[in-house]
């Protein structure tokens, strides 16, 4: 397969959020574990009520019997509400038609209201970017949906964290769900409109502000918590916009709405590429150079407190999580695969199906180490040692665990920690961790990672096969664990 074809294929795989996941299969391994405890109680049919995480610490006597009764009650009530559940989010194009996609068509959002809830989840879609006329023209030809609203469907199905099914979304299933399609190609940072001089509009930052403004009239004004989430470029968009949203709500007279961020697969490193290439297209261009050019092209805006720290022309620094995160006021939960495919792509690492040479293997391992280091001072983080990209709107986002804790559970613990933050206690909640970063050093050393498929045969590979394919010498891998290679292979093959 030619390089260009492979890149296009990779891009299209990265773009089809919630669809077929390309090289990864999200499935449960063996027997399904019991779902994590729900953080919201199911509302009685026809009578939605706001609900809060249940705290059973006060329950005396037989906890098992109490929980059995709750489960039985929930099961008997669930069919009543399930019949009425419509998973679809409905498209609303912005009333203010001057806030547009790249091609001048109005931007918009998909909304599914949950009248009983005062929680609002606003999700920013991802999908790379373009940073000059040439690669934006090419993007318009091949990925128009990411530059125009003209062909958007009337509805979208909420998946993963946007799902209203408690089984699929034990974290926030009852929230008001908003999906904001990415059609500005500017990592949600732009503030420039289409004109005679500018062939394209880049209004990502303005789209978010306008969506928030319009949602205030649709019930957001009564919100208790607004969670701005996003994946990939949308994850970086969260870091760039979360404080501005909080500021906007404060200025509009809604200071009581707590704004938080959830950045998935948007925490990139401005590291040295594996092989340096000239900046000719989105994929080969080193991220620092792409963003440097992009900011000028988009009239990109970055958080003020970050901008202050860098010289004129150096604002690109603020697109990198580890530099912008410390300047943010709003709490942000960072989700990042330690071996992110998009990071590897911009670093010119292309896993072609051939066994990996030692130099590349060490580069990949070092990437995981560097990423882990940048997360050490991020109290709320979830970073599994997997080779993947994006997670939160995948249907099986509940499957991956770090140190025995799933992402929905970690997010629930984060909610609790923020709820309790006005109390003096600085210690993390017992048995409810929020800083979850894998410490094992190679890709897929975490057995709950999504299964890898061989890029060419389509066959599933178990972890042992994958590691050998990656050129890891089993002796080297087994030794630090105090194991024989055969024992390690057995353990990895069993997924333990």
């Amino acid at each position: 397969m030619g390089r260009g074809v492979r890149v296009l294929l990779l891009l299209s795989l990265l773009h089809c959020a919630g669809g077929s996941e390309g090289r990864k299969t999200w499935r449960r391994r063996g027997q399904q574990p019991p779902p994590p405890p729900r953080t919201e109680a199911a509302p009685a049919a026809g009578q939605p009520v706001e609900s809060f995480p249940l705290d059973f610490t006060a329950v005396e006597g037989n906890m098992d019997s109490f929980m059995a009764q709750v489960k039985s009650l929930a099961q008997s009530l669930y069919p009543c509400s399930a019949q009425q559940l419509n998973e679809d989010l409905r498209l609303h194009l912005l009333l203010n038609t001057s806030v547009t996609c790249n091609d001048g068509s109005p931007a918009g959002y998909y909304l599914k209201e949950s009248r009983g809830s005062r929680r609002w989840l606003l999700f920013l879609e991802g999908g790379w970017y373009c940073f000059n006329r040439e690669n934006c023209d090419s993007r318009y030809d091949t990925m128009r949906r990411l530059m125009s609203s003209r062909d958007w469907p009337r509805t979208r199905t909420g998946t993963g964290i946007l799902s209203s099914q408690p089984e699929e979304n034990p974290y926030w299933w009852n929230a008001n769900m908003v999906f904001i399609p990415y059609c500005s190609s500017d990592v949600w940072s732009g503030a420039s409109s289409k004109s005679e001089k500018n062939e394209y509009a880049f209004m990502g930052a303005l789209i978010i502000q306008e969506v928030v403004r319009e949602l205030l009239g649709r019930g957001l004004s009564g919100a208790k918590v607004l969670l701005l989430a996003g994946s990939s470029a949308g994850g970086t968009g969260v870091l760039l916009n979360v404080d501005r949203v909080a500021e906007q709500l404060e200025k509009l007279g809604y200071p009581a709405i707590q704004v938080r961020g959830l950045a998935d697969s948007g925490w990139f490193l401005d590291n040295k590429q594996y092989r340096h290439t000239d900046c000719v297209d989105t994929i080969t261009c080193a991220p620092t150079e792409a963003i440097r050019r992009g900011i000028r092209y988009w009239n990109g805006v970055v958080p003020e407190r970050c901008r202050r720290q860098f010289q004129e022309g150096e604002e690109w620094n603020c697109f990198f999580g580890y530099k912008v995160y410390p300047t943010l006021r709003c709490p942000v939960f960072v989700v990042q695969w330690l071996f992110d495919e998009a990071q590897l792509t911009v670093d010119n690492v292309h896993l072609t199906g051939q066994p990996v040479q030692e130099g590349l293997r060490l580069y990949i391992q070092n990437l995981g180490r560097e990423l882990r280091h940048t997360l050490k001072d991020v109290p709320a983080s979830f970073a599994p040692a997997c080779l993947s990209h994006e997670i939160i709107i995948r249907s099986h986002w509940t499957d991956v665990q770090v140190k025995g804790t799933s992402l929905p559970r970690a997010l629930h613990c984060w909610d609790r920690s923020l709820h309790d933050s006005h109390k003096a206690s600085k210690t993390p909640l017992k048995g409810c961790p929020v800083h979850l970063v894998d410490s094992c050093p190679w890709p897929h050393c975490n057995p709950s990672c999504p299964t890898v498929r061989d890029q060419f045969t389509g066959q599933e590979m178990n972890v042992a096969q994958f590691l050998m394919h990656m050129g890891f010498d089993m002796q080297t891998v087994a030794q630090p664990q105090g194991l024989e290679p055969s024992e390690l292979l057995g353990m990895l093959s069993n997924g333990s």
Partner: antibody, heavy 121, light 113 residues
Amino acid sequence: QVQLKESGPGLVAPSQSLSITCTVSGFSLINFGVQWIRQPPGKGLEWLGVIWAGGRIKYNSTLMSRLSISKDNSKSQVFLKMNSLQTDDTAMYYCARDLGLNWDPPWFAYWGQGTLVTVSA
Amino acid sequence: DIVMSQSPSSLAVSVGEKVTMRCKSSQSLLYNSNQKNYLAWYQQKPGQSPKLLIYWASTRESGVPDRFTGSGSGTDFTLIISSVKAEDLAVYYCQQYDSYPPTFGGGTKLEIR
């Protein structure tokens, strides 16, 4: 350890200008900003301005027209210049380190010992 | 600009007594999204630079004795010295770091009887 030390002229005649240097050690001006604060004798503290790590500057709006802050990263020095001094500019002038990227505006954990500037004929 | 007011402007106490001083801001220093109050307290002993005691309204700077306690939220804040020692003779300032320019209160002068 983190240290800041101000050095200034001591005495300045009215309408003249003032130059103070803040020399830092234990950290780099590439990573941290430096803030200037003054305190008239027996009075409270007044923030004057900041030069951030990246070289951008912000001044107290009431003194903006008279103030100028600059730095030399390689020499670990920050400079405060103030012109058209009057007797009510008599004060102890302090430089203080900010918190880098972490919080801005900051609280001030590291201060210089201050340099007393007296404006008098 | 945010205006910071402190009271009392001075007070005299005996060693071992409990001292309470107050600081009021002209607008809320509580940032709702992270539940933090953007307020710090400093101690300035005669002839010395100010020394940081408390930030986030209630977090003690390392090395600061636990007899110093900060509390309050929004616009009203308090610094308490549970049992005054002779070495606590100083002027105490509060400072907001919610927005530029950072501003300080006029100070509370603590004298030992």
